[in-house]
């Protein structure tokens, strides 16, 4: 079914999200001792490794963009402070229309 | 056909607990796609969105600040209903609240609206 | 919480007049912006969605534009049926926030 269809997909990105993570610090010289944050899969999309201050912009899923093509719509920042990651603003929830991913049960 | 019946009192004491229900026909409050949402309209604050409840494999609650000490939002699954109850009330409250489905196409949006309920809060 | 302002707060048409209806955000929305028609009594109902999307049923004399923090709403050839209060509301920061509304009277 289409749940089984998109978890497929998650786990394709998760993973995919992982190896660039690990790309981006090699970039930037990233290790666990390092100010900043590190990269992260959230578990519906992939935060790329950044210094204190930095805010990073995503977008929605692709999977879930299928339903909102306005370039100017489906964007979510974190910003990277002392204490880590802020929380995702707007909520996944407002911006993309879901707010976690359900794999099938 | 979505349709949405409010029930409960229009006179509420203050200090007590507002209560009133949604009851939905022509879809289910477990519905994936939706949200269950009540909003209030008074001459003083306009239309205010108070939060929602709805289902993703769990339940979950949005509220707003202004009420989020005061207020719970339940489904009922076995009677496809959802309520509002918000507590310690005072005269600010007084409004008419109504019921709303929300669902997304590139945003939320209010699409079927209860009739209204005017809920006055007096001694 | 996000502040949403409509301007004029009322104004008198004529049926057949062309009308327009402006909406502003105090921040950025992008296009998370939907309009709704009230009748004295009665609950909201929906006309436009995600700024410019036109709810299925409305008629196509409704239209919408904007993205940022200016909006309007556009009725083409006003018709009997269309006098009513029209409210704008944010749908991308909790809690949602809706404008004070314009009141749309017979001339």
């Known amino acids: 079914g289409s749940m089984a269809h998109s978890d497929g997909i998650f786990k394709k990105e998760q993973a995919m999200c992982l190896e660039k993570i690990q790309r981006a610090n090699e970039l930037m010289g990233f290790n666990d001792s390092s100010p900043g944050c590190p990269g992260m899969w959230d578990n519906i999309t992939c935060w790329k490794p950044a210094h204190v201050g930095e805010m990073v912009l995503v977008s929605c899923p692709e999977l879930f963009r299928i339903f909102n093509p306005d370039q100017d719509m489906g964007v979510v920042s974190r910003n990277c402070t002392e204490d880590g990651w802020s929380e995702p603003f707007p909520h996944y929830f407002d911006a993309c229309g879901f707010d976690e991913y359900e794999s099938e049960t | 056909q979505v349709q949405l019946q409010q029930s409960g009192p229009g006179l509420v004491k203050p200090s007590q607990t507002l209560s009133l229900t949604c009851a939905i026909s022509?879809?289910?409050?477990?519905?994936?796609?939706?949200?269950w949402n009540w909003i209030r309209q008074s001459p003083s604050r306009g239309l205010e969105w108070l939060g929602r409840t709805y289902y993703r494999g769990k339940w979950k609650n949005h509220y707003a600040v202004s009420v989020k000490s005061r207020i719970t939002i339940n489904p009922d699954t076995s009677k496809s209903q959802f309520s509002l109850q918000l507590n310690s009330v005072t005269p600010e409250d007084t409004a008419v609240y109504y019921c709303?489905?929300?669902?997304?196409?590139?945003?939320?949006?209010?699409?079927?609206w209860g009739q209204g309920t005017l809920v006055t809060v007096s001694s | 919480d996000i502040q949403m302002t409509q301007s004029p707060s009322s104004l008198s048409a004529s049926v057949g007049d062309r009308i327009t209806i402006t909406c502003r955000a105090s921040q950025q929305i992008a296009r998370y912006l939907n309009w709704y028609q009230q009748k004295p009594g009665k609950a909201p109902k929906l006309l436009i969605y995600?700024?410019?999307n036109l709810q299925s049923g409305i008629p196509s004399r409704f239209s919408g534009s904007g993205s940022g923090t200016d909006f309007t709403l556009t009725i083409n050839s006003l018709q009997p049926e269309d006098f009513a209060t029209y409210f704008c509301q944010q749908a991308i920061i909790q809690p949602y926030t809706f404008g004070p509304g314009t009141k749309v009277d017979i001339k």
């Open positions: 995600a700024s410019y």
């Open positions: 022509g879809d289910s409050v477990s519905n994936k796609q939706a949200t």
């Open positions: 709303a489905r929300g669902m997304w196409n590139q945003n939320w949006f209010l699409d079927h």
